[in-house]
């Protein structure tokens, strides 16, 4: 168990031309919170796919009016951190979601209005314990800073907060395996669940399930005295009688640094020498470019060759967002009827439909075509009675002269009213209620509700929102 | 071709309840649109009186005309109407039926009926 | 109640004209950008021009456009035609599920 934090240092307008216009006024204040989304691994889920590791909302910031005919400062920023708690073991690797919402407090009747102003999405490597991680992402023509980390809560311990401490038996000393638990060395690490048979003299786990030898024992289960023959290595005590020891595991072993960074041994653990433009414990974080990976979904990464210019991710076709971070998953709305099997192609949607029905949504059972013609495209289908046609894609009804109904599988959730646009379907949420679907409530879990409603998120690309 | 057609009486009574008919042709309530009513006073602006979702007929009206206006669907007959309680001279009006089908406009309008109210 | 103020209320333009109506909302619009500019001309319905506030509908001459988010949006033509003389209406829905529309701006030809 463990807490992740997020401490966001500044947002306001980014460098370069086409600085935005300050989101408050004299005669509409408003104030910034923040929204964070976590996901374990790096998540290739929708935008909108449950925030698996845990989400958080920030306090409301400061009041802020713009000062008439001055730029778009930095804002006004909520104090404190978001702290987004975890119950099992940190996963290492994560995706990030980071929203900024508008509060505005005129005179609206039912209490404040909320807009999103930017959404900015990541996937990052980070080992809890370690130092924060400082983190620069543009939204549009917004850039934010911010810096985040991992913590593990007591008793657990460990770059997955997968270890426990516990008080020392002892006055002096530690168990064989364990060390002292940094930074409470009056405590030691509780040993693991190891490998069953794991030597508890000579053998220890840092990972349930697991047997790893000390200095001068091998095999499976550490039972195995180290063969001393031709002495070579340069770890463990040696002579002619008795040979060499194997090495044990080395913190290095296996390069922790990522990006290039080299590794250099420390008394306690180890140390990234990072290359230009990467910083963190091993070397995980660079400001937002290319070299960081910021496209999901096998997207292609344009620009952003250093830290000060932006990047544009250009999806696959079934991705969109600024991040590629959002499946277009369109068969969650289950469109295919009477009983047929969805096929989400990326470039087109495909129902494969059980015998006896036909049409772009298997919406139609096989009947004679009479004669009669079919609507924007469809083609008439023969059967065993009156006509059917089977409609081009986005049409239906008995001469595909309706449009098919992509609201039917009643995809806005909370109450929301979804309407079935030419464009696809839009939500528009109930008051206290956001999000694409409307699935996010505005106020933090166990709050009261809110009086009055945020917008909706659209479903398209999140810049389009900036 | 998808249309609005607006019908009613042309001359209501004051004190009298207006009933209009909007009668659609070319799509379905199936799918899921605002259906609303706008009313223009002579030589004034448009406003907008109320809308029904036909999600779940949900409906809500401007803050003036709730408890006078009701807006209902016969979706057998592919229409909805629009009562106006207690008409006073300051309800004649152009009355339109309007379809909105996401992002917040209405992309289609019927052609409009004029209504007056008069003894 | 949401109010929605166009000005101005009216104006004279020549042909070729860069002509600019303004549209302020008492109450952010839902989703920063659902709202909408309509031209109507004596005895016709309302025909939509833009929706979501810079959208340009189909159909609709290129020198219409629109921008803004929030509470405050503006309507351009850039080079007005005869054609144009009308009265234009903005038009915006709001949280709640509530629309409102504003008080319209005649656009005349000098």
């Known amino acids: 168990a463990g807490v992740f934090e997020l401490q966001i240092h500044s947002f306001g307008p980014g460098p370069g031309p086409g600085a935005p216009r300050s989101p408050c006024s004299a005669r509409l204040p408003c104030r910034l919170f923040f929204r964070v989304c976590l996901k374990p691994g790096l998540s290739e889920e929708a935008a909108e796919s449950p925030c698996a590791l845990g989400a958080a909302l920030s306090a409301r910031g400061p009041v802020y009016t713009e000062q008439p005919g001055a730029p778009a400062p930095d804002l006004p920023l909520p104090d404190g951190l978001l702290q987004v708690p975890f119950r099992d073991a940190w996963p290492g690797t994560f995706s990030f979601i980071i929203e900024t919402w508008r509060e505005e407090l005129g005179d609206q009747i039912g209490g404040p209005a909320w807009s999103l102003l930017a959404r900015v999405a990541g996937r990052r490597r980070l080992a809890a314990g370690g130092p924060w991680a400082r983190d620069i992402q543009r939204a549009g023509a917004w850039e934010l800073r911010f810096s985040y980390r991992a913590r593990c809560e007591p008793p657990a311990v460990g770059t997955a907060c997968t270890r426990l401490c516990r008080p020392r038996s002892a006055p002096s000393r530690c168990g064989p395996g364990l060390r002292p638990c940094a930074p409470l060395e009056d405590e030691c690490e509780a040993p693991l669940v190891c490998r069953a048979g794991c030597s508890p003299e000579h053998g220890f786990c840092e990972q349930p399930g697991e047997c790893r030898c000390l200095e001068g024992w091998t095999g499976p289960l550490c039972t195995v005295p180290v063969s001393t023959s031709s002495c070579l290595s340069p770890r463990g005590p040696s002579s002619a009688t008795t040979g060499c020891l194997v090495p044990g595991p080395g913190p290095c072993d296996g390069n922790p640094c990522a990006n290039g960074g080299s590794c250099s041994e420390t008394p306690r653990s180890f140390e990234c020498t990072c290359p230009r433009g990467f910083y963190g414990l091993r070397c995980e974080v660079s400001g937002v470019t290319c070299a960081d990976g910021p496209c999901f979904n096998g997207g292609l990464c344009v620009g952003g060759a250093d830290p000060d210019s932006a990047y544009i991710c250009h999806c696959p076709p079934g991705f969109q967002g600024s991040n590629c971070e959002k499946r277009v998953d369109r068969c969650s709305l289950q469109p295919c009827r009477n009983g047929g099997l969805c096929l989400d192609l990326g470039h087109a949607l495909r129902c494969r439909c059980r015998a006896g029905f036909a049409g772009p949504r298997c919406e139609h059972d096989l009947d004679d075509c009479a004669g009669r013609a079919c609507a924007n495209g469809g083609t008439c289908v023969e059967g065993g009675g009156a006509h059917r046609c089977s409609c081009a894609l986005g049409f239906g009804g008995r001469d595909c002269r309706e449009r098919a109904d992509p609201c039917a599988a009643r995809p806005c959730a909370h109450g929301g009213r979804c309407y079935a646009h030419f464009s696809g379907l839009v939500c528009a949420c109930a008051p206290g209620y956001m999000g694409a679907r409307c699935e996010f409530p505005v106020h933090p879990d166990g709050a009261s509700a809110l009086p009055a409603a945020p917008p909706g998120l659209r479903p398209g690309d999140p810049q389009r929102y900036l | 071709q998808v249309t609005l057609r607006e019908s009613g009486p042309a001359l209501v009574k004051p004190t009298q309840t207006l009933t209009l008919t909007c009668t659609f042709s070319?799509?379905?309530?199936?799918?899921?649109?605002?259906m609303g009513w706008v009313r223009q006073a002579p030589g004034q602006g448009l406003e907008w009186m109320g809308t029904i979702y036909t999600g779940d007929y949900s409906t809500d009206y401007a803050s003036w005309a709730k408890g006078r206006v009701t807006i209902s669907v016969d979706r057998s007959k592919n229409q909805f109407s629009l009562k106006l309680s207690s008409v006073t001279a300051a309800d004649t009006a152009v009355y339109y039926c309007a379809r909105h089908t996401g992002y917040g406009y209405f992309g289609l309008w019927g052609q409009g009926t004029l209504v007056t109210v008069s003894s | 109640d949401i109010q929605l103020t166009q000005s101005p209320s009216f104006l004279s333009a020549s042909v070729g004209d860069r002509v600019t109506i303004t549209c302020q909302s008492t109450e952010s619009v839902y989703g920063s950008d659902w709202l909408s500019w309509y031209q109507q001309k004596p005895g016709q319905p309302p025909k939509l021009l833009i929706y979501?506030?810079?959208n340009l509908e189909i159909g609709v001459p290129s020198r219409f456009s629109g921008s803004g988010s929030g509470t405050d949006f503006t309507l351009t033509i850039n080079s007005l035609e005869a054609e144009d003389a009308a009265t234009y209406y903005c038009?915006?829905?709001?949280?709640?599920?509530?629309?409102?529309f504003g008080g319209g701006t005649k656009v005349e030809i000098k």
């Open positions: 070319g799509f379905s309530l199936s799918s899921s649109y605002d």
């Open positions: 038009q915006g829905y709001y949280s709640g599920y509530i629309y409102a």
């Open positions: 979501q506030a810079s």
